[in-house]
């Protein structure tokens, strides 16, 4: 099943997020992703855990998953590079870089997103944008078109409370509010964009969604700048 959902959001403006990618397994949406360079998409490592025997591809330039759109193109994956420290049983280091079979054809609907290199926490309360094709309600309805939601960043101390994530949020992770509006599971790999810059990637650990006491967890890309640069080099 697809890993992910945007809860409490709405349909995104078509093609206004040219960095948005759909990571697909055997032709079906699996996870979100974000174009960070002409030939590289950043996603979450856990997305490929169950994909050993399947064909992984990346869809760029899409708003609708099913309808024909001039900007849409499906790319094969030349190489999948999970973070070397990612493990199935932990949310830590949940990053994956996918090298496309060729450089993406750039245009208004396909363009890399600048990512944060300054390793500094986003101020609590900052409103950040999350987008994805995951299910949109607890009944499991899957949208055909890209959805998005604005979420406030939550301070790490609150996120680490015993009633919340109980100390699991390291300095390499960040949280956002999850009170009725939320990302979850496999919007996993999708971008958390603050002030027009990629700050976080939705983690793919399983957790209840839309519950204010279980905030959304995002991998801070600035904390992994050296690794990202080394892979893209």
């Amino acid at each position: 099943p697809p890993r992910g959902r945007i809860l409490g959001g709405r349909e995104a403006e078509a093609h206004a997020r040219p960095y948005m990618a759909s990571v697909q397994l055997n032709g079906a949406h699996l996870c979100g992703g974000v174009l960070v360079a002409e030939q590289w998409v950043l996603s979450a490592a856990h997305c490929l855990e169950d994909a050993a025997d399947g064909k992984v591809q990346v869809l760029l330039g899409a708003h609708s998953l099913s309808q024909p759109e001039p900007s849409k193109r499906l790319y094969d994956v030349l190489r999948a590079v999970p973070h070397p420290d990612s493990q199935p049983d932990t949310i830590d280091h949940d990053l994956l870089l996918l090298q496309l079979s060729e450089k993406a054809t750039l245009g208004p609907a396909v363009r890399p997103l600048p990512w944060q290199r300054v390793d500094r926490d986003v101020a609590p309360g900052t409103l950040c944008d999350v987008a994805g094709w995951g299910i949109v309600n607890h009944a499991g309805r899957r949208p055909d078109s890209l959805q998005h939601v604005l979420l406030p960043v939550l301070d790490r101390a609150t996120c680490n409370r015993r009633t919340h994530h109980d100390g699991a949020i390291t300095e390499r992770l960040m949280c956002a509010e999850s009170n009725r509006r939320d990302s979850c599971k496999g919007d996993s790999g999708g971008p958390l964009v603050c002030g027009g810059v990629l700050e976080g990637v939705v983690t793919s650990g399983s957790r209840v969604c839309g519950n204010r006491k279980k905030p959304g967890i995002y991998t801070r890309v600035a904390s992994y700048a050296a690794w990202i640069d080394s892979v893209l080099a």
């Epitope: 349909e11 997020r17 101020a123 900052t126 960043v153 009170n179 509006r181 964009v193 002030g195 027009g196």
Partner: antibody, heavy 121, light 106 residues
């Protein structure tokens, strides 16, 4: 058409409190954040804070801690801001504002009509 | 917090002139918004995400910049452009505005 209609001018005494309102129309009130901005007489704009009317989640500029409280009433599609312990420094025009698009950026694309608060004995 | 400094505070120009006003941020931001305000009215969105004109804004306006330095340019000033222009950053809470540039037409 999205519209934000604010309550009328207020003349209040120092030390008192005032609650101003912002009634929204033309869109789903619970779908978007409502922000408040202060414009003092030097025409300086100060962001006060926001509220998510759907769940009550709010954030505030620390500068206004203890001064401003933002709330929202879903049933009437109205946002409120209460200002307390008023002094002459609080005399200003207060705006509600929001972003009603669906792009990756957000800005204040709709502003309220403004409420003038005058603090004077 | 990110402090935005606008210059000049007052700009005087004749119709048809090209004018540029600047907004400098105390820390790097990725995009900047601009608003226009005329006396007695609420601010109006004017330029969003650095260079995109809001609905109804004449094409003689343009925005540019990156990092800590942004600008709003009017290629040929007209009388109706007389107003105060404010920049605003949305990269980090608290969201801040510049002190404004008042454009006067000679």
């Amino acid at each position: 058409e999205v519209q934000l209609q604010q309550s009328g001018p207020e003349l209040v005494k120092p030390g008192a409190s005032v609650k101003i309102s912002c009634k929204a129309s033309g869109y789903s009130f619970t779908g978007y954040y409502m922000h408040w901005v202060k414009q003092s007489h030097g025409n300086i704009l100060d962001w006060i804070g926001y509220i998510d009317p759907d769940n009550g989640v709010s954030s505030k500029n620390q500068k206004f801690t203890g001064k401003a409280t933002v709330t929202a009433d879903k049933s009437s599609s109205t946002a409120y801001m209460e200002l307390r312990s008023l002094t002459s420094e609080d005399s200003a025009v207060y705006y509600c504002a929001g972003y009603y698009g669906s792009s990756w950026y957000w800005y204040f694309d709709v502003w309220g009509t403004g409420t003038t608060v005058t603090v004077s004995s | 917090q990110i402090v935005l400094s606008q210059s000049p505070a007052i700009l005087s120009a004749s119709p048809g002139e090209k004018v540029t006003m600047t907004c400098r941020a105390s820390s790097s931001v990725s995009y900047m918004h601009w608003y226009q305000q005329k006396p007695g009215s609420s601010p109006k969105p004017w330029i969003y995400a650095t260079s995109n004109l809001a609905s109804g804004v004449p094409a003689r306006f343009s925005g540019s910049g990156s990092g800590t330095s942004y600008s709003l340019t009017i290629s040929r000033v007209e009388a109706e452009d007389a107003a105060t222009y404010y920049c605003q950053q949305w990269s980090s809470n608290p969201y801040t505005f510049g002190g404004g540039t008042k454009l006067e037409i000679k």
